[in-house]
Interface confidence: medium
């Protein structure tokens, strides 16, 4: 799901799943502004007051982060310049499942996209030889 148009930028997300107890990734991409100080990335979760994660002015700003995500989130800071706003989520919990919004603001405009994040005890299928 994505938004584009005048004063909006295109943001793209991908539905993904996370294994409980492991690390997961919520994928989000956008056309990057080459000016890193002009980029703001916000991750929000439906039903949660406060932010999942915020990256702005070239660094993380966790002042408004919800306590359930404290110490468990990170963006790929070196890849923001090439349009990667994906969020790394450590130690995935069952309660992490839900609808997330990846919100991007740059000097050109803003945009957002939603993704459904599923959690569970997933495992690789057995391969019988």
């Amino acid at each position: 799901f994505g938004i584009s148009g005048k004063h909006f930028i295109t943001v793209t997300t991908f539905t993904s799943a996370g294994n409980i107890g492991e690390d997961g990734t919520l994928s989000c991409t956008f056309e990057p502004d080459i000016k890193l100080n002009g980029i703001v990335i916000q991750w929000l979760k439906e039903g949660i007051k406060g932010l999942v994660h915020e990256f702005k002015e070239g660094k993380d700003d966790l002042s408004q982060q919800h306590e359930m995500f404290r110490g468990r989130t990170a963006v790929f800071a070196d890849q923001v310049v090439v349009g990667n706003a994906s969020l790394r989520l450590k130690n995935v919990q069952l309660t992490d499942a839900g609808t997330y919004t990846c919100y991007i603001r740059t000097s050109k405009g803003k945009g957002n996209a939603n993704l459904e994040y599923k959690t569970g005890a997933f495992s690789m299928p057995e391969i019988n030889v």
């Epitope: 990057p32 070239g58 310049v81 090439v82 740059t106 000097s107």
Partner: antibody
């Protein structure tokens, strides 16, 4: 092999025009922003212009704003720099560079000489 | 515009020496500071990105540190191929700006 190859440099009179090209290979060109950087003889490096992956963001140094135009054709894996109203102070080696974490891939450069 | 000031402008050293080059930004650039090496007649080569991250393929004798406004490039043990000019560059905002360069020469 990841590679950038500039072309189009040469001798031009003040007030003249040139178009530089930068052919990219060995990587997904359409995923990366690109820069032009120049170096006058015996001097340091000077950033000239930048363009984002889909051309949505374009920036210029004040010294070239209104005279130079950066563009790209992702279908041809090529970056361009159209240079108009050239001045003696534009004489330099012009490099294209890939925008990643730093300017991580550079071309070999093409020389532009502005002289009457 | 953000001004980048390198020191020293030139430096004489011997093979095996430990060398430090500093770069100061006129305002904060967080950790968006890159270091390049350039040899005569060649294109610059990225050594360090984001202040302290070693670019792939660059020898581990090169290291970078700092954040905000003050940054350092260190070569732990100079090798003959390290004699070149070194530039810092901020990639925090446009106009991107380079330091004036530090020429590292053989003593």
């Amino acid at each position: 092999e990841v590679q950038l190859l500039e072309s189009g440099g040469g001798l031009v009179q003040p007030g003249g025009s040139l178009r530089l090209s930068c052919a990219a290979s060995g990587f997904t060109f359409s995923s990366y922003g690109m820069h032009w950087v120049r170096q006058a003889p015996g001097k340091g490096l000077e950033w000239v212009a930048s363009i984002s992956s889909s051309s949505g963001y374009i920036y210029y140094a004040d010294s070239v704003k209104g005279r130079f135009t950066i563009s790209r054709d992702n279908s041809k894996n090529t970056l361009y720099l159209q240079m108009n109203s050239l001045r003696a102070e534009d004489t330099a080696v012009y490099y294209c560079a890939r925008a990643s974490s730093g300017m991580d891939v550079w071309g070999q450069g093409t020389t532009v000489t502005v002289s009457s | 515009d953000i001004q980048m000031t390198q020191s020293p402008s030139s430096l004489s050293a011997s093979v095996g020496d430990r060398v430090t080059i500093t770069c100061r930004a006129s305002q904060t650039i967080r950790s968006y500071l890159n270091w390049y090496q350039q040899k005569p007649g060649k294109a610059p080569k990225l050594l360090i990105y984001a202040a302290s991250h070693l670019q792939s393929g660059v020898p581990s004798r090169f290291s970078g540190s700092g954040s905000g406004t003050d940054f350092t490039l260190t070569i732990s043990s100079l090798q003959p191929e390290d004699f070149a000019t070194y530039y810092c560059q901020q990639s925090y905002t446009t106009p991107y700006t380079f330091g004036q360069g530090t020429k590292l020469e053989i003593k």
